[in-house]
């Protein structure tokens, strides 16, 4: 006869490990008992359980409620046991010793490998600002057994570097992603991808990049000279800029207060029916937490009753 078993049994932390041991013998042979033991290089051989053909399953008190036989139907020649709720400390070598008659005893050893799936965490780096040099965008850490693989999935150009720390029963891997911040990266996903044999599929954590910037300001609305004549309605100036965080807009008039009736609505300056009083230099002030920008325009409102005057529109930033 011979024993059918496995060299390595792999199980995920918390799952039940089936330790296989099947005696394949002649029809007239019987199994008296199967003794299971943990083989430890320091502590020697320690019995886990004994499956007795007549008196049933005996379990070492140290493994009480953790060792069971597989559910029925059971073959009398099957000495396999289930080790419930595998923990890291269960990892190691096991021995099954099958006592048969009349053939005698057979033994086999196997290794139990307990996979500890990682629970990754992603930590964003310091605030990103356009104009910085190479900067940490995010770091991702995952600890498991065996060591997990940590990579990055992104369209953003950057560099990644990894380091690992080995502990007695696991390894922690940290990967950092560095980049040179630019406004084009704003809102782009940066995904940490963790692979491990104990995971059915990769674990992914996505961080959305936020790059602080403030674009140059410009003013639109002076393109059509005909709009800037006395009596015209609906004339507006719109301040153009963009930024992260979104900027705030402020309108002022360089040569005095804003004329009465002129309304400020965010980035837009709305005029009442135009008069020559509305002529002047207007300044759009754009700011966010990162920076501020100004753009100024000169508005001259033409009186059509005064044919000696031409519309003179000057824009300056």
């Amino acid at each position: 006869g011979e024993l059918e078993t496995s060299d390595v049994v792999t199980v995920v932390l918390g799952q039940d490990a089936k330790l296989p041991c099947f005696y394949r013998g002649d029809p007239d042979e019987q199994v008296g008992q199967v003794a299971w033991a943990r083989v430890d290089p320091n502590e020697g051989i320690r019995e886990l359980a004994l499956l007795h053909s007549k008196y049933g399953l005996h379990v070492n008190p140290a493994y009480e409620d953790r060792v069971e036989q597989p559910p029925p139907p059971r073959d009398p020649l099957d000495g396999s046991v289930l080790l419930r709720n595998a923990v890291q400390a269960d990892e190691g070598e096991y021995e099954c010793r099958v006592s048969t008659f009349p053939a005698g005893s057979f033994q086999a050893r196997m290794r139990l490998r307990v996979l500890v799936p990682p629970l990754p965490s992603l930590n964003p780096g310091p605030p990103l600002e356009e104009g910085q040099g190479l900067t940490l965008a995010a770091s991702c850490t995952a600890e498991g057994s065996p060591a997990p693989s940590v990579t990055w999935d992104t369209e953003v150009k950057g560099t990644q570097s990894s380091r690992s720390f080995t502990h007695p029963r696991s390894a922690a891997v940290t990967s950092e992603f560095h980049l040179v911040p630019s406004r084009s990266m704003n809102g782009q996903p940066l995904t940490c991808v963790v692979s491990h044999p104990g995971l059915l599929q990769d674990r992914r954590i996505t961080h959305t990049l936020q790059v602080a910037f403030l674009a140059e300001a410009s003013v639109r609305g002076l393109e059509d000279q005909n709009l800037w004549q006395v009596g015209r309605e609906g004339a507006t100036l719109k301040c153009l800029s963009e930024g992260q965080p979104p900027p705030k807009y402020n309108w002022t008039r360089l040569d005095g207060p804003l004329p009465s009736g002129v309304r400020v609505k965010g980035d837009t300056l709305g005029f009442p029916p135009l008069t020559t009083e509305h002529s002047g230099v207007y300044v759009c002030h754009v700011s966010n937490e990162l920076s501020s920008r100004d753009s100024q325009v000169t508005v001259e409102v033409l009186d059509p009753e005064d044919p000696g005057k031409q519309v003179d529109l000057v824009s300056a930033s």
Epitope: Y55, N60, S99
Partner: nanobody, 118 residues
């Protein structure tokens, strides 16, 4: 041949404790399981608990959590600590040894009476 000698029986009130001991001599190298059986009047002899040379144990459902078997392989002894005793535990308790040649209990002690009064 294996000889088994028990000690420690007696009368105890319900809820009390008793400790039974059993010493083996003779052909002890052939012993595999050691255990305790009991037989109440007009009832079948039943296996209460047994223990392997490596310390693996099995208990009858009726005594789980109340009885504890221990074995000293070097001294060839097996003890049974009985706590929270009940009147239905009243019986003659037998120490038994199983030969690893036969895989059944074939050596028996003379028995010791345990009586639990209510």
């Amino acid at each position: 041949e294996v000889q088994l000698v028990e000690s420690g029986g007696g009368l105890v009130q319900a809820g009390g404790s008793l400790r039974l001991s059993c010493a083996a001599s003779g052909s002890i190298s052939s012993i595999n399981l050691m255990g305790w059986f009991r037989q109440a009047p007009a009832k079948q002899r039943e296996l209460v608990t047994s223990i392997s040379p490596g310390g693996s144990v099995r208990y009858a459902d009726s005594v789980k959590g109340r009885f504890t078997i221990s074995r000293d392989v070097a001294k060839n002894t097996v003890d049974l600590q009985m706590n929270s005793l009940k009147p239905e535990d009243t019986a003659v308790y037998y120490c038994a040894a199983e030969s690893e040649r036969t895989y059944y209990f074939d050596s028996w002690g003379q028995g010791t009476q345990v009586t639990v009064s209510s």
